[in-house]
């Protein structure tokens, strides 16, 4: 009978970094080993390929490598086929994106004394914590009529005034690393007294 000496196990992995799913098999006859991802055979590429009976990743990809991997062994003489335990990656990643206007719907609708909400489109796993900046200066919660939570990706200005004008950017960090906004947002609010 086919015996798995080493079975693949679920593990943490970093986006773009190396990883290895191990599989070692013993059987009476010569063995063919191949891998399944969500039940479909894994084809070798430069990025992901069989290394002996193990599966090697030159650069883990959160989209292409999400799912359940299984090592499958076939004894060529007896015809027996057996599958290993399931294994998957907990892929840690962070990806930069722009700062966008969430409310109101368009810049034309921004008026003094209205509420303005900006959104930081930096995503990641685990969920990152966010830091906002105006003209390069970090913003902390509760100062100058704005609400910001490091857990939330939104910055709310209520009410918005001329003192809030400036270039808004954000950065986020997680166990994987840090990223800052790829595109920033310039907020211009005219002084009503003029």
């Amino acid at each position: 009978a086919i015996v798995f000496i080493k079975q693949p196990s679920s593990q943490d992995a970093l986006q773009g970094r190396r990883a290895l799913l191990r599989c070692e098999v013993e059987a009476p006859g010569p063995v063919h080993v191949y891998w399944l991802l969500d039940g479909a055979p894994v084809q070798d590429t430069e990025r992901r390929f069989a290394q002996g009976s193990s599966l090697s990743f030159a650069a883990v990809d959160r989209l292409q490598d999400s799912g359940t991997f299984q090592c499958v062994a076939r004894d060529d003489v007896t015809g027996e086929e057996a599958r290993s335990a399931n294994a998957s990656f907990n892929i840690k990643w962070i990806e930069a994106g722009p700062v966008v206007l969430k409310h109101p719907a368009s810049e034309a609708e921004i008026q003094p004394q209205t509420q303005v909400t900006l959104r930081c489109h930096i995503d990641g796993h685990p969920r990152p914590t966010y830091q906002w900046f105006r003209d390069g200066t970090p913003l902390s919660d509760g100062q100058s009529n704005h609400t910001v939570s490091s857990k939330e990706r939104n910055l709310t200005l209520r009410p918005a005034g001329p003192e809030h004008s400036g270039l808004y950017s954000c950065c986020a960090h997680s166990a994987f690393g840090q990223a800052c906004s790829s595109q920033n947002f310039t907020l211009s609010i005219a002084d009503e007294s003029f």
Epitope: G29, P30, V31, H32, V33, G52, S53, R74, D75, D76, V77, T78, G79, E80, E81, A82
Partner: antibody
Framework: QVQMQQSGAELMKPGASVKLSCKAT????????IEWVKQRPGHGLEWIGE????????NSNEKFKGKATFTADTSSNTAYMQLSSLTTEDSAIYYC??????WGQGTLVTVSA | DIVLTQSPASLAVSLGQRATISCRAS??????????MHWYQQKPGQPPKLLIY???NLGSGVPARFSGSGSGTDFSLNIHPVEEDDSAMYFC?????????FGGGSRLEIK
């Protein structure tokens, strides 16, 4: 012990289809590949294809695509191979085998007008 | 497809002597540290019987007079000493790739 019992000889007309059976006993049917091999006098042995009954997954020789279809019934531990659009070239002995070790006795198919 | 060329197509060997059959593959049949090359014996009216698997491993119940060797593309089956009962057809087969392919066969006659 492992045994592969194949169905009896068939005399068929050109253009017809035939379904050969291979009943497996003595092992867990779903976990082993069953292969099919053709033998014609003077043509040696030809590998047609294979099926893993537990999953229904199969592999086949490109040469027999459209000619041979593999199925398996796990309730009766029987594998089947259907041959379609028969011609005299399909006249042969057909073997089923579990891996390389356990072979059926063969089924003779004769195609004649 | 991997093409297997067997030679000779037929041979006649005296009782007690050595019979050697060769099988050459059009490309290597080695993978995972094994040679996926096998040898069968077939007698009239019977299915093929596995003699040697993975180039050099003796099949279950096969006498030690049978031996196999080789790797990559060149393989051979040896029978020594030959016995009367060894009169049969012998086939090599590769199972590294689909489609699995067989050699053309070698007929052994005992003198």
């Amino acid at each position: 012990q492992v045994q592969m019992q194949q169905s009896g000889a068939e005399l068929m007309k050109p253009g017809a289809s035939v379904k050969l059976s291979c009943k497996a006993t003595g092992y867990t049917f779903t976990g082993y590949w069953i292969e099919w091999v053709k033998q014609r006098p003077g043509h040696g042995l030809e590998w047609i294809g294979e099926i893993l009954p537990g999953s229904g997954r199969s592999n086949s020789n490109e040469k027999f695509k459209g000619k041979a279809t593999f199925t398996a019934d796990t309730s009766s531990n029987t594998a089947y191979m259907q041959l379609s659009s028969l011609t005299t070239e399909d006249s042969a002995i057909y073997y089923c085998a579990r891996g390389k070790l356990s072979w059926g006795q063969g089924t003779l198919v004769t195609v004649s007008a | 497809d991997i093409v297997l060329t067997q030679s000779p197509a037929s041979l006649a060997v005296s009782l007690g002597q050595r019979a050697t059959i060769s099988c050459r593959a059009s490309e290597s049949v080695d993978s995972f540290g094994n040679s996926f090359m096998h040898w069968y014996q077939q007698k009239p009216g019977q299915p093929p019987k596995l003699l040697i698997y993975a180039a050099s491993n003796l099949g279950s119940g096969v006498p030690a007079r049978f031996s196999g060797s080789g790797s990559g593309t060149d393989f051979s089956l040896n029978i020594h000493p030959v016995e009367e009962d060894d009169s049969a057809m012998y086939f090599c087969q590769q199972s590294k790739e689909v489609p699995r392919t067989f050699g053309g066969g070698s007929r052994l006659e005992i003198k």
